[in-house]
């Protein structure tokens, strides 16, 4: 209630002679701060004096007096919250009740804490789970109701007196709720741990033994079994007898049932520890074990492999792989049930014995078509020889052989003809299903293996075919040898290398890219006129009049081909210059006179120069010279000069006459 001081601390603390005790404690006073604190040992209230009597272990007052015992006993608290205490070392006679006498300005309180100090270190306590099963992880807990900052301890686990390999996790608690040291060990017990002793040992900081606790492990496990067989090697022949015995080496709890298994399947009516097999057959070969069950579950013995020996059975052949591709590798496997395994094999190909083949497997690294056929074998062991089985069929597949492309046409073939070709082959497995042709074209295939080329091109040089089953086999290309008229006929200037100037020596070549047959004739023409019949057309000294459009023709026995028209351009300096006058060569003063310099030039004249009768140049550079207004003094002979990139040309003199106007004559 509200009239009480509120304290929190463990109810009882445990320790032993020479150790220490640490008392975690919190409080809340009724009013104000703590002014006085006394720690009593076994306090008793004196009604006469209204005070407590008892041994004072610690005293803290306003005047600051402290008894000598205070070195051993320490108050680690404060004036309002903390009342933690430490006694180090603690003695046997400290057992009993500790009384915390607290006084504030107006209130008093006595709080009691039990202290249990034993003569020797008390043992920890091992806690086990209710049931332990083999191979199931469990946690072993070792708990000690002690912890003190001034007295370090450790807890160690032992199994049959030997420290355990597993890592333990130690934790301590020093709180107002609890004080303890705990060690937890995670452990997966095996059936062999059943009945073994586990110890938790309390040690001081130096590893010195202080106390311990022990428990015996009760590990529940399935029965552990041993199997014995007669004969000991478990190898017998058909008709022999076999005895197997099952022995239980350990079971917790006790076993309840026994059974026998062959190849994992339970044998009916076999529920005793002995299994008797009389006059065994080869079918009784297999893996035997006994199974014994308890409440935990069934336990199985190791397996005994019983081998019943017999002569080989009729054999079968397995082929890897059929059909086989020519050139690939193939493996034949002779399969025959026998015990012991066959030691010798005889192989047959199409009923005929294959010499030198005595192994279970026959490997052919490179299959050829003649390897096809039926393969069979016979197996043999110490007990006898088996029978030859039905055998297996090897199918050898290969691309079409000896493929040829055949031209059906009469030769020679001319450009534009229709050409028929056929694709032939010698043998094929599997059968030919399609044909391919090279090069590809928009050609007809009127029937399988026949190609029709309509309007054959001059450049259809060679054709090859392929016959295809799962693979394609290509024939060597066959030359069509198509004959055609000359192609790509063109005129080419051989000389000069640069532009043609008047007076140059000029050679034109009639070129063509190809012709079949190669024997050709040439023709040159200009404006429909025949000029020559050589491959070259030569001009010793070209003149402007030779300029024009030239063509050449090339023909062979198939036909003739013309070049594109080729323009021959001749460059020359301005020529045939003359000065023309407008409106005429006689003009009245004051009017306008236009002089024009006319010329023939290639390339055209770039600029003109004008001269008067004294050969003085006039400041005009265009084709026309305009005099306006013209004066009588302008009468005289004029001439012009034209310039282009080739050179210059000049005109003869042309005379302009300027006469007086009627006005001028009238003034005179």
């Amino acid at each position: 209630d509200s009239s009480k001081w509120v304290f929190e601390h463990p109810e009882t603390l445990y320790a032993w002679e020479g150790a220490c005790v640490w008392i975690p404690c919190t409080y809340r006073a009724l009013d104000g701060d703590l002014e006085s604190f006394i720690l009593f040992h076994n306090p008793e209230y004196n009604k006469n004096t209204s005070k407590f009597d008892g041994t004072r272990l610690y005293e803290s007052t306003k005047d600051g007096k402290v008894p000598s015992e205070q070195k051993r006993v320490q108050f680690l608290g404060d004036k309002n919250k903390n009342c933690t205490l430490s006694i180090h070392p603690v003695h046997l006679n400290d057992s009993g009740q500790l009384g915390l006498r607290m006084e504030s300005k107006t209130e008093k309180w006595m709080e009691r804490i039990h202290l249990n100090v034993s003569e020797r270190p008390f043992p920890p306590h091992i806690q086990l789970p209710p049931e332990i099963q083999e191979s199931q992880e469990v946690t072993l807990t070792c708990l000690l109701n002690f912890s003190c900052y001034g007295y370090p301890i450790q807890l160690q686990w032992l199994l049959e007196g030997v420290p355990m390999r597993q890592a333990a996790v130690t934790s301590t608690s020093l709180t107002i709720k609890s004080v303890f040291t705990r060690s937890e060990l995670k452990f997966s017990p095996q059936w062999s741990h059943h009945g073994k002793i586990v110890t938790c040992q309390l040690q001081d900081a130096d590893g010195k033994f202080l106390s311990n606790d022990t428990v015996q492990l009760n590990v529940k496990h399935t029965p552990k079994l041993e199997i014995k067989v007669t004969p000991s090697d478990a190898i017998v022949r058909e008709g022999d007898s076999v005895t197997m015995t099952c022995e239980v080496s350990s079971s917790n709890p006790e076993y309840t049932t026994v059974s026998w298994l062959k190849d994992g399947t339970s044998l009916k009516k076999q529920n005793t520890f002995t299994l008797n097999l009389r006059e065994v057959t080869k079918d009784q070969s297999g893996k035997y074990c006994c199974q014994v069950s308890n409440d935990v579950g069934p336990g199985r013995s190791e397996e005994v492999f019983l081998q019943v020996q017999y002569a080989p059975e009729p054999s079968t052949v397995q082929i890897l792989h059929s059909p086989a591709v020519e050139g690939s590798q193939v493996e034949f496997l002779c399969m025959s049930l026998a015990n012991p395994l066959p030691t010798n094999y005889t192989w047959y190909h199409n009923g005929k014995e294959m010499q030198g083949r005595t192994e279970e497997k026959v490997h052919i690294p490179k299959i050829l078509p003649w390897h096809a056929g039926t393969y069979s074998c016979v197996a043999e062991n110490i007990l006898g020889t088996g029978q030859r089985g039905p055998g297996a069929e090897l199918d050898v597949q290969y691309p079409p052989k000896k493929v040829t492309t055949v031209i059906q046409n009469p030769m020679p073939i001319r450009e534009g003809d229709t050409v028929t070709l056929s694709c032939n082959y010698n043998s094929s497995n599997p059968s030919v299903t399609r044909y391919e042709w090279k090069p590809h074209g928009a050609w007809e295939e009127p029937s399988l293996g026949v190609l029709k080329i309509q309007n054959v091109g001059w450049d259809n040089t060679t054709i090859a075919c392929a016959a295809c089953n799962s693979w394609c086999s290509w024939a060597s290309p066959v030359a069509l040898n198509v004959q055609y008229a000359p192609r790509d006929v063109r005129v080419r200037k051989i000389k000069p290398l640069s532009e043609i100037h008047s007076g140059n020596s000029v050679s034109l070549q009639c070129d063509f890219s190809s012709s079949h047959p190669k024997e050709v004739q040439f023709f040159w023409e200009k404006n429909g006129r025949l000029l020559g019949k050589e491959s070259q057309l030569n001009f010793d000294s070209i003149s402007p009049e030779d300029a024009g459009s030239y063509s050449c023709w090339v023909n062979n026995s198939i036909g003739q081909t013309a070049s594109k028209a080729w323009t021959l351009e001749v460059l020359y300096a301005p020529r045939r210059l003359r000065v023309s006058m407008s409106p005429g060569d006689q003009v009245m003063e004051g009017k306008s006179a236009t002089l024009t310099c006319e010329s023939d030039a290639n390339p055209p004249v770039s600029h003109y120069t004008w001269f008067d009768w004294n050969n003085q140049s006039l400041p005009y550079h265009s084709q026309k010279l305009r005099l306006e207004p013209v004066k009588v003094q302008h009468s005289g002979a004029y001439w012009c000069q034209g310039t282009n990139s080739v050179g210059k040309g000049r005109s003869p003199l042309s005379t302009l006459t300027v006469y007086y106007s009627p006005e001028t004559i009238g003034r005179r």
Epitope: D612, P619, G636
Partner: antibody, heavy 123, light 107 residues
Amino acid sequence: QVQLQQSGPGLVKPSQTLSLTCAISGDSVSGNRATWNWIRQSPSRGLEWLGRTYYRSAWYNDYAVSVKGRITFNPDTSKNQFSLQLNSVTPEDTAVYYCARGESGAAADAFDIWGQGTTVTVS
Amino acid sequence: DIQLTQSPPSLSASVGDRVTITCRASQSISSYLNWYQQKPGKAPKLLIYAASSLQSGVPSRFSGSGFGTDFTLTISSLQPEDFATYYCQQSYSTPQTFGQGTKVDIK
């Protein structure tokens, strides 16, 4: 070196005649290696060639179409100068007027020597 | 009449820049094309005559090229005194004509 010195009024009334003179020093107006040109410049028309006078075996004049019929060039050999007369002027004739030599030799009639320019306002 | 078209009408450049001005004639004028520089309040000054010949006294950073109808004036490394207006002019036929000008100013 060759120099051209311009003279003439800066202000002319509309419909009157504009007269400008260009005095030559270091060359002859009647030399046969030059042309003597008049050029004007205004913001609206830029540089505009008005015409030229030159002597070879006779005196020649060339006029721009824009001023033909209103313009006259007069060479004066005694004073070694040449003049421009532009009749019936309008405000459109307001411009800076330049005289320039056209070098008819290697310079291909380029204007290598210019007068200082005369600003003429028609108002 | 022969028309001359200059481009660009104006351009901004920095000292040290390479500057190119083009002039196109409406018909072939051979090599009768001249280039002038004009500064405010001054008469034009001849730089290049006959398309590519440098006028006496003009710095070698100025050069001209072209023939027929297309011509170019190049200033290889622009100097502070080169900020001005540049004109082309043909002396091939009368009337002699000028381009409209290209103004070069400081960027």
